[in-house]
């Protein structure tokens, strides 16, 4: 399954929107910085097959979409930018979903790397718990916004590797 070029453009647009969503200076939130343990090895496109990488990408985008679809998120961000950002993610999910469905239908496809899915889920659990702990403060959201920009950048790199594998 070939991800359309528009998928990468969408990812870049999502990153730009996320950058624009910043409301406060990151420097005023230095005391709130946190290492969420982004599972970088899951974004090493050479580590596993394309079909598995697409499942990991889907999980990453889906969890990001869910994170920014909460009521707490709606209260934290400028509404029109948040809606545009969510729309970009939703479009990416549709592209990835079509690919995963195609792979699921092929019986020779190897089993999904479930530990990679779990690693992504745990990463977002750490982010969720951090926000809860910090009571969804503006600085907590700013730290999370910066972290998601980082994780989306990693997923962009993974997509580039996947296209080279075609």
């Amino acid at each position: 399954c070939d991800l359309p070029q528009t998928h990468s453009l969408g990812n870049r647009r999502a990153l730009i929107l996320l950058a624009q969503m910043g409301r406060i200076s990151p420097f005023s939130c230095l005391k709130d910085r946190h290492d969420f343990g982004l599972p970088q090895e899951e974004f090493d496109g050479n580590q596993f097959q394309k079909t598995q990488a697409i499942s990991v990408l889907h999980e990453m985008i889906q969890q990001t979409f869910n994170l920014f679809s909460t009521e707490d998120s709606s209260a934290a961000w400028e509404q029109s930018l948040l809606e545009k950002f969510s729309t970009e993610l939703y479009q990416q999910l549709n592209n990835l979903e079509a690919c995963v469905i195609q792979e699921v239908g092929m019986e020779e496809t190897p089993l999904m790397n479930e530990d990679s899915i779990l690693a992504v889920r745990k990463y977002f659990q750490r982010i969720t718990l951090y926000l809860t702990e910090k009571k969804y403060s503006p600085c907590a959201w700013e730290v999370v916004r910066a972290e998601i920009m980082r994780s989306l950048s990693f997923s962009t790199n993974l997509q580039k590797i996947l296209r080279r594998k075609d």
């Epitope: 889907h58 969890q63 699921v104 779990l118 659990q125 718990l129």
Partner: antibody, heavy 119, light 108 residues
């Protein structure tokens, strides 16, 4: 609000199969993995597996791989679990539960379907 | 798979009494992925405590959770009649996800 609706009971004969349903409402069905859990009378809970309704990928507990098959129908926002070659060991209540994170992990459960395997 | 052992299997407590239920894991579980559920007869389980020590919405403040590694506990500071139920610990730190066999808590 989030709801997961399951039929109350199913009576099936040994050796037969049964397909249990879990109809979701109150949230975007394709955004969250759906899990299935078994509970024998007066016993603990056993995780059977999960399915991502968005694309149909499944992850199973090895103990249930040859027993359960998880599927979804996006058009009717319903998750299904087929149990095959039923024996008395399969008589139990089967719950569906929605995934999520933090305070949303297994925060929503169906009422459970009691499966009775009897001749 | 990670086996979760709960003790005691059944216990009874008087109103006002302090109660501690334990959950022992066969191998280490990260505290972020250790949860507790309450279940009453004829009902589905209810999320009670998430990530070891956080109370789910609507759970009374007399409940608390603690632990790390292989040893976890749920404590009720002052038992009330409505707390009579079964309590299950659960881990999703690694596949397959597992539950404890449960502790049935009765009121004296």
């Amino acid at each position: 609000q989030v709801q997961l609706q399951q039929p109350g009971a199913e009576l099936v004969k040994p050796g037969a199969s049964v397909k249990l349903s879990c109809k979701a409402s109150g949230y975007t069905f394709t955004n969250y993995w759906m899990h299935w859990v078994k509970q024998r009378p007066g016993q603990g809970l056993e995780w059977i597996g999960e399915i991502n309704p968005s694309h149909g990928r499944t992850i199973y507990n090895e103990n249930f791989k040859s027993k359960a098959t998880l599927t979804v129908d996006k058009s009717s926002i319903t998750a299904f679990m087929q149990l095959s070659s039923l024996t008395s060991e399969d008589s139990a209540v089967y719950f569906c539960a929605r995934g999520g994170l933090g305070p949303a992990w297994f925060a929503y459960w169906g009422q459970g379907t009691l499966v009775t395997v009897s001749a | 798979q990670i086996v979760l052992t709960q003790s005691p299997a059944i216990m009874s407590a008087s109103p006002g009494e302090k109660v501690t239920l334990t959950c022992s894991a066969g191998s280490s579980v990260d505290s972020s992925y250790l949860y507790w559920y309450q279940q009453k007869p004829g009902s589905s389980p209810k999320l009670w405590i998430y990530s070891t020590s956080n109370l789910a919405s609507g759970v009374p403040a007399r409940f608390s959770g603690s632990g790390s590694g292989t040893s976890y506990s749920l404590t009720i500071s002052s038992m009330e009649a409505e707390d009579a139920a079964s309590y299950f610990c659960h881990q999703w730190s690694s596949y397959p996800f597992t539950f404890g066999s449960g502790t049935k808590l009765e009121i004296k």
